[in-house]
């Protein structure tokens, strides 16, 4: 809106900052146990992994940055069950990795709930 | 604990993953208005900026990744006051940027609240 009032370089820097804040897959640290909804007696080592998740800003405050496509990355982790009855096992754990993001509006809630099986 | 059971390469990959998830300053997108606690008639363009904030995992569930040192980065943004009485003003906005992080125990909550002026 202010192209006539400010020098092009300043506007360019501001615009580049805005572009970098846009909704996109960003490297994020997720806790494996809470991600998988595991019981409290199952632990993972390391407890956290790095994956890409949607994040950032949208052009409208009422829009939410959400994933439109997901891949599942296999991470090699030690699964430990307590009490420890055997050697911690090295297991492949599949964690959701967001590959595509979009700023989406909220759809109106239905008066009834939808349960997906 | 499992060096005798698994090959060194696998353990190295797991360890590298763990190091990358550790509590550290990470580039994050923050919404300026909510960050500054501005009134609803003051807006910024762009509304979001990139700064570093503490994030990641700690070795114990009882610890939280918190900032131990902070610098303030000046971002050039347009400040827009509504109703619009003048041209949007280009202002330097100081946003907190975490430069140091540490896994700290959660402090017990005080029965009274602390207000910083």
């Amino acid at each position: 809106f202010a192209a006539t009032f400010y020098d092009i370089e300043t506007l360019k820097v501001i615009d580049e900052e805005w572009q970098r804040t846009q909704c996109s897959p960003r490297e994020t640290c997720v806790e494996v146990a809470s991600e998988l909804g595991k019981s409290t007696n199952t632990f993972f080592k390391p407890p956290c992994v790095n994956v890409f998740r949607c994040g950032g800003c949208c052009n409208e405050e009422s829009l939410i940055c959400m994933n439109t496509s997901t891949s599942y990355i296999s991470k090699q982790l030690f699964e430990i069950s307590v009490p420890l009855t055997s050697v911690p096992e090295l297991v492949p754990v599949k964690v959701a990795n967001h590959t595509g993001c979009k700023c989406l509006p909220t759809a109106p809630r239905h008066p009834y709930s939808i349960i997906r099986r | 604990f499992a060096a005798t059971f698994y090959d060194i390469e696998t353990l190295k990959v797991i360890d590298e993953e763990w190091q990358r998830t550790q509590c550290s300053p990470r580039e994050t997108c923050v919404e300026v208005a909510s960050e500054l606690g501005k009134s609803t008639n003051t807006f910024f363009k762009p509304p979001c900026v990139n700064v570093f904030r503490c994030g990641g995992c700690c070795n114990e569930e009882s610890l939280i990744c918190m900032n131990t040192s902070t610098s303030y980065i000046s971002k050039q943004l347009f400040e827009i006051s509504v109703p619009l009485t003048s041209v949007p003003e280009l202002v330097p906005v100081k946003v907190a940027n975490h430069t140091g992080c540490k896994c700290l125990p959660t402090a017990p909550r005080h029965p009274y609240s602390i207000i910083r002026r």
């Epitope: 572009q19 409208e60 909220t106 759809a107 | 807006f43």
Partner: antibody, heavy 118, light 112 residues
Framework: QVQLVQSGAEVKQPGASVKVSCKAS????????MYWVRQAPGQGLEWMGY????????TYNQKFKGRVTMTTGTSTSTAYMKLRSLRSDDTAVYYC???????????WGRGTLVTVAS | DIVMTQTPLSSPVTLGQPASISCRSS???????????LHWLQQRPGQPPRLLIY???NRFSGVPDRFSGSGAGTDFTLKISRVEAEDVGVYYC?????????FGQGTKLEIK
């Protein structure tokens, strides 16, 4: 100052397509979503959908899905709305409007009258 | 879809007198982020619509302070404290909390 300049009036036959353009100036085109709204003669406003010029993402009103396509030309800061399989009840003034980050459509084009008649 | 119902559909007002338009939505317009995206537009004869009020009560640039908005949840009101000749036209409420974005059917403000 912000300006949205729309293309001129069109007369189309039923079954044909129309493409309306909206040239934006006075602001960073990719920083705001562009909405399309229509108004039939003597009627109220109807939201058709919007496009995010930054990445071309679109969200359409289900009512127009399959018939409407919204695109942008970022080099020319122009938004386009194409409506196919026109019917007589598509006769309306078609507006482009910029969506404010904080809500509402803050700047509007003057409108493009599309008349569908055989 | 969210249905926006305006009352009255027509409002004859004497110059200098107040006017009030009501807008009711079929579902709450409170967004998951806590904001309420209910806006008011004015359309003068032969003109495109113009934003008056956004997010329930915030006046847009250049809008006189005789216009004010209020309400919460599903019930909203636009008030004009003293009607002037230039206020003649159709007033629409609109919501941008949900998709599709929807408008009220419009309220025609005319001078008695």
């Amino acid at each position: 100052q912000v300006q949205l300049v729309q293309s001129g009036a069109e007369v189309k036959q039923p079954g044909a397509s129309v493409k309306v353009s909206c040239k934006a100036s006075g602001y960073t085109f990719t920083g705001y979503n562009m909405y399309w709204v229509r108004q039939a003669p003597g009627q109220g406003l109807e939201w058709m959908g919007y496009i995010d010029p930054y990445n071309g993402d679109t969200t359409y009103n289900q009512k127009f899905k399959g018939r409407v396509t919204m695109t942008t030309g970022t080099s020319t800061s122009t938004a386009y709305m194409k409506l196919r399989s026109l019917r007589s009840d598509d006769t309306a003034v078609y507006y482009c409007a910029r969506a404010s980050y904080y809500g509402g459509m803050d700047y509007w084009g003057r409108g493009t009258l599309v008349t569908v008649a055989s | 879809d969210i249905v926006m119902t305006q009352t009255p559909l027509s409002s004859p007002v004497t110059l200098g007198q107040p006017a009030s338009i009501s807008c009711r939505s079929s579902q709450s317009l409170v967004h998951s982020n806590g904001n309420t995206y209910l806006h008011w537009l004015q359309q003068r004869p032969g003109q495109p619509p113009r934003l008056l009020i956004y997010k329930v009560s915030n006046r847009f640039s250049g809008v006189p302070d005789r216009f004010s908005g209020s309400g919460a949840g599903t019930d909203f009101t636009l008030k004009i404290s003293r009607v002037e000749a230039e206020d003649v036209g159709v007033y629409y409420c609109s919501q941008s909390t949900h998709v599709p974005r929807t408008f009220g059917q419009g309220t025609k403000l005319e001078i008695k």
